[in-house]
């Protein structure tokens, strides 16, 4: 069964700056990735970035840089200042659409005991929804 993993890291240099990394563990090719915060996309979450393998990347503040790391993983850096900046217990969700298999979404947040610059290893987060 395909799985999605989510890793959230706080940057040591900027304590309110976050890096989110997400990956898809499955055989299908990725057709779309949506990163949101505050809950799953479409269920109260707010979209931070959308990545399409052919048409490119769109991102919304406070997202600063979204990019493909591999064909099945992405990373997103969040700006740390301003009213819309994330806090330590913010939940981030990644939804991977794999055509024609379907969609898989998982969420994660900063590990409770993590020091700045450290993070938990990228283990698969619980799959919240598979369309």
């Amino acid at each position: 069964t395909p799985e999605v993993w989510v890793q959230v890291r706080m940057e040591a240099t900027e304590l309110s700056s976050f890096t989110i990394r997400c990956g898809f563990l499955g055989s299908g090719s990725i057709s779309l990735v949506t990163v949101s915060w505050g809950g799953p996309n479409g269920a109260g979450g707010t979209t931070l970035a959308v990545l399409h393998p052919e048409r490119g990347i769109r991102q919304w503040a406070p997202a600063r840089q979204a990019r493909w790391e591999t064909q099945s993983s992405i990373s997103l850096i969040l700006e740390g200042s301003g009213a819309s900046s994330p806090c330590a217990n913010t939940t981030f969700c990644c939804k991977f659409a794999s055509f024609p298999e379907g969609s898989w979404e998982a969420c994660g947040s900063l590990p409770p005991s993590s020091d700045p610059g450290l993070s938990a290893p990228p283990t698969p987060a619980p799959i919240l929804r598979a369309d």
Partner: antibody
Framework: EVQLVESGGGLVQPGGSLRLSCAAS????????MHWVRQAPGKGLEWVSD???????YYLGSVKGRFTISRENAKNSLYLQMNSLRAGDTAVYYC???????????WGQGTTVTVSS | DIQMTQSPSSLSASVGDRVTITCRAS??????LGWYQQKPGKAPKRLIY???SLQSGVPSRFSGSGSGTEFTLTISSLQPEDFATYYC?????????FGGGTKVEIK
């Protein structure tokens, strides 16, 4: 109600310039890609240009270097600056919304551009 | 560039007929395809998105199917208001491209 209203069309001589505008209302403009699509008289639809929410731009090969798409999110406005116009650019130009990358869903009523001497 | 070949270019049908229009992509586009209806002097209106999902407010007699390179728009029972021109659009990669259109006329 979601609405797109184009303006700025008209008659222009070959080699001339024209600036089209599109006023958007009824939705959060900055969240959407915006496109220009044209239709020559009696012909089919042809995509012209796309601008992403942060200003990323994409063009049809035949207009690249002549047309410039831009947006002003604070004014809910989309623009198309058309330079070095040719007879082949004569068409109705539509402003179209897209929730990236899910395809165009809302269209304006169109504005007519005629390039003729 | 991805070419979208739409057929037929025109067809004559009667009210109540089942009508099928096809679009073939020159390379795979997954399900990144929409179908649009255009009436004379009017802007196009989206009927189907993601190849097979019905746009809100569109009658259920319209349906879409297909993925990859072969796509179909079906009108199960043609109504008087359905006489129009229909276009497919691929939005998988730039430049976005439309099919050539299918004009549905009254027999």
């Amino acid at each position: 109600e979601v609405q797109l209203v184009e303006s700025g069309g008209g008659l222009v001589q070959p080699g001339g310039s024209l600036r089209l505008s599109c006023a958007a209302s009824g939705f959060t403009f900055r969240n959407y890609d915006m496109h220009w699509v044209r239709q020559a008289p009696g012909k089919g639809l042809e995509w012209v240009s796309d601008i992403g929410n942060s200003g990323e731009t994409y063009y049809l090969g035949s207009v690249k270097g002549r047309f410039t798409i831009s947006r002003e999110n604070a004014k809910n406005s989309l623009y198309l600056q058309m330079n070095s116009l040719r007879a082949g650019d004569t068409a109705v130009y539509y402003c179209v919304r897209e929730e990236f990358p899910l395809g165009m869903d809302v269209w304006g009523q169109g504005t007519t551009v005629t390039v003729s001497s | 560039d991805i070419q979208m070949t739409q057929s037929p270019s025109s067809l004559s049908a009667s009210v109540g007929d089942r009508v099928t229009i096809t679009c073939r992509a020159s390379q795979g586009i997954r399900n990144d395809l929409g179908w649009y209806q255009q009436k004379p002097g009017k802007a196009p209106k989206r009927l189907i998105y993601a190849a097979s999902s019905l746009q809100s407010g569109v009658p259920s007699r319209f349906s879409g199917s297909g993925s990859g390179t072969e796509f179909t728009l079906t009108i199960s029972s043609l109504q008087p208001e359905d006489f129009a021109t229909y276009y497919c659009l691929q939005h998988n990669s730039y430049p976005l491209t439309f099919g050539g259109g299918t004009k549905v006329e009254i027999k």
